[in-house]
């Protein structure tokens, strides 16, 4: 048989007497129907005039129109009303009435749960007519069901706008258990209790649970759904699966691995993206974080410099993106870097070393005893400084850069002159007359121009005046001399 | 509160059968499995199988298979432990253990001492 | 089967010393339980998956280890821990218990 029909069941034909037609009574398309007692409410109304209806699925025709003949009520005959079949098994259930003759257009609609059935259902309605009456049979079959298919399934039936339904057979699709919610993957503390949790479904009810760790059952009894298992901590990975029996059998979870939080492995390929006189720009591809998202990192910079007092300096940093500016260097200075990152339980060792350089830097000291006086026969000025004493970690000297601004009468006008390193003199042609010159002179390297010295001042008078006394800037100091010829 | 109560000492003929008995109080008697223990005179404790108590299928460790048996009286939540044609080497006290996750046993009966002597 | 070797048989110590026992396994296990044993009574339950102390025991005592070699320390001894230790594996069966570790109070 397609279904399995748990029904203490007297089988009894559809009809009373055999049909016309070629109407097949294998035991696939007719089931063994349950004899059940007791009457329905009936439906009255006319064949050609509806009275108010009662509730119920019978209707009882009133007297004929030839006005002599009672007609027999109007209703479903009953039929199984409890189908428990596997998942994946055919069934076929039906509804038959008989309807007299007097009546046209009938229609029977199955419905499901309330919901009418349309579309793509397999229903069949058969047509067995007699003298009297034509017996109908209403059909539905599903192949190879599915838990979607569990519920409550009725006939109705339309006639002279009066519907007529049938007693309900429901339909319950049984299979191995259905998870509704299965364990989940988790990162956990070392040697901290956390809960899993793994629900299923039947039917068949009810639906049992044992918990599996690393293959080994953790209960050796089931528990009912859902169930809830407190790990009371692991030092090592493990993996949980849980296992649901039901009457039709077991279904396994699918195996979740619950790992343990560790401190993150260290950064790796740290790498120099740019360097300048007093920064470097440093990348990193961060290590394994552990199982936990990584909180911050911190770079390490130590000088490679016998002399350095070998102190460390850490700038901290967030962890993404893995790139940091470090800054506040020297110039011209070697550098070895690492980087270390950590999460919540902890930092990483810290990365393989990298060497680094800062470039040469811009010179700190501007030229000393910047001396500057008049050349009137040649009509320029003559300026004479000192080298300044630059550090080494300005670099090498390429030469100086010689700002003079003449100012008369409200206009004002900068030149700039570049000189070589070898140089501590300059002459510059006269611009303006009747004007004052200011010279400021800066040291040049490789890493920029350095500060510009205290601005020296000559007043330039009209032809005529001569005069050589210079004006200069003493070495040390910072005054703002001014020498007026 | 939870308990196991076991039956009184027993003194028995080689050859005789005993039968011990475990009652439980203060939880569901078939939710949980009852492992059943040995410790001989001065010895350490050595884990007999048990029973569960849902099904009533005993699981037996290796060396405690033939003439030992499992077995419960679900309506009286009480397990019991008998042992057919018994032997000097039998001598011991039996315990009774309540199963738990990761076959934890967090509570015991008192012990039921059985001595077997001619 | 899994086999437990408890080591040492008998541990003698004075009260207020640190001491440990261990618990090792012929292969790798997921939990081990320990339970204390005074004579003429049953085991009581002690210490449960390697580190949860069970109720009423003194926070004195700590458990410990992974894989093959697992631990009880007591911290400070006190008279009334002179007991048998019994450890028991969990992540094979049959369930197995070592052969105990007497602790003897000096």
């Known amino acids: 048989a397609i279904t399995e029909a748990r029904e203490e069941a007297k089988p009894y034909p559809l009809f009373p007497g055999p049909l016309p037609g070629s109407l097949q009574t294998d035991h696939t398309s007719l089931l063994s129907l349950p004899h059940t007692s007791g009457y329905q409410p009936a439906l009255m109304f006319s064949p050609t005039q509806p009275g108010r209806p009662y509730t119920g699925n019978v209707a009882i025709p009133r007297v004929t129109s030839a006005g002599s003949k009672l007609l027999p009520p109007l209703a479903f005959k009953h039929t199984v009303g409890h189908i428990i079949l596997s998942e994946h098994k055919d069934v076929k259930f039906n509804c038959s009435i008989s309807v007299p003759n007097i009546y046209q257009d009938t229609t029977i609609s199955w419905w499901k749960d309330g919901k009418e059935l349309l579309g793509a259902h397999h229903a069949i309605t058969q047509f067995y007519p007699d003298d009297e009456v034509t017996a109908i049979i209403a059909s539905f079959s599903i192949t190879s069901v599915q838990r979607s298919d569990n519920g409550s399934y009725i006939c109705k039936m339309k006639i002279n706008n009066e519907e007529i339904v049938s007693d309900p057979i429901y339909i319950e699709v049984q299979g191995l258990p259905h998870f509704t919610k299965q364990p989940e993957s988790m990162n956990v503390t070392r040697n901290t209790a956390f809960n899993l949790t793994c629900q299923a479904v039947g039917p068949p009810e009810p639906v049992n649970i044992f918990w599996v760790q690393n293959s080994s059952r953790v209960n050796e009894q089931p528990e009912k759904s859902p169930s809830v298992l407190t790990v009371p901590g692991l030092t090592e990975m493990a993996v949980f699966s849980c296992e649901a029996h039901n009457d039709k059998g077991l279904t396994v979870s699918k195996g979740v691995q619950i790992n343990i939080k560790a401190i993150p492995s260290p950064p790796t390929e740290v790498s120099i993206h740019n360097s300048t006189a007093h920064s470097i720009l440093i990348s990193w591809v961060p290590g394994f974080d552990g199982y936990s998202p990584f909180r911050n990192c911190s770079v390490q910079v130590k000088e490679v410099d016998p002399l350095s007092n070998g102190s460390v300096m850490i700038f901290n940093t967030s962890a993404s993106p893995h790139m940091y500016q470090i800054k506040q260097l020297q110039a011209l200075a070697n550098y070895s870097i690492g980087v270390s990152c950590m999460n919540e339980i902890g930092w990483s060792a810290v990365s393989p070393w990298i060497l680094a350089s800062t470039t040469e830097g811009a010179p700190s000291v501007a030229p000393l005893n910047v001396t500057v006086f008049l050349n009137e026969s040649r009509d320029n000025v003559d300026i004479r400084w000192m080298k300044p004493l630059t550090k080494r970690q300005a670099g090498e000297l390429v030469g100086y850069r010689i700002s003079h601004v003449w100012q008369s009468a409200g206009i004002s006008k900068e030149l700039l002159e570049e000189v070589g390193q070898n140089n501590s003199r300059a002459q510059i042609s006269v611009q303006v007359h009747n004007a004052t010159c200011t010279v400021r002179i800066a040291a040049v390297t490789k890493g920029g121009v350095g500060p510009f010295s205290d601005p020296v001042k000559i007043f330039i008078p009209a032809h005529g005046w001569v005069d050589h006394a210079p004006s200069s800037t003493p070495a040390p100091g910072n005054a703002d001399p001014v020498l007026i010829i | 509160q939870i308990q196991l109560v076991q039956s009184g000492p027993e003194l028995k003929k080689p050859g005789e059968t005993v039968k011990i008995s475990c009652k439980a109080s203060?939880?569901?008697?078939?939710?949980?499995?009852m492992n059943w223990v040995k410790q001989a005179p001065g010895k350490d404790l050595q884990w007999m199988g048990w029973?569960?108590?849902?099904?009533?299928?005993?699981t037996y460790a290796d060396d405690f298979t033939g003439r030992f048996a499992f077995s419960l009286e679900t309506s009286a939540s009480t397990a019991y432990l008998q042992i057919n044609n018994l032997k000097n080497e039998d001598t011991a006290t039996y315990f009774c253990?309540?199963?738990?996750?990761?076959?934890?046993?967090?509570?015991w009966g008192q012990g039921t001492l059985v001595t077997v002597s001619a | 089967q899994i086999v437990l070797s408890q080591s040492p048989a008998i541990l003698s110590a004075s009260p207020g010393e640190k001491v440990t026992m261990t618990c090792r396994s012929s292969?790798?296990?997921?939990?081990m339980h320990w339970y204390q044993q005074k004579p003429g009574s049953s085991p009581k339950p002690w210490i449960y998956?390697?580190?949860n102390l069970a109720s009423g025991v003194p926070g004195r005592f700590s458990g410990s280890g992974s894989g093959t070699s697992y631990s009880l320390t007591i911290s400070r001894v006190e008279a009334e821990d002179a007991a048998t230790y019994y450890c028991?594996?969990?992540?094979?069966?049959?369930?197995?218990f070592g052969g105990g570790t007497k602790l003897e109070i000096k």
């Open positions: 253990a309540k199963g738990g996750h990761y076959a934890w046993f967090a509570y």
């Open positions: 203060g939880y569901t008697f078939t939710n949980y499995g």
């Open positions: 029973i569960n108590t849902y099904t009533g299928e005993p």
């Open positions: 292969s790798s296990v997921s939990y």
């Open positions: 998956a390697t580190s």
């Open positions: 028991q594996q969990w992540g094979s069966n049959p369930r197995t």
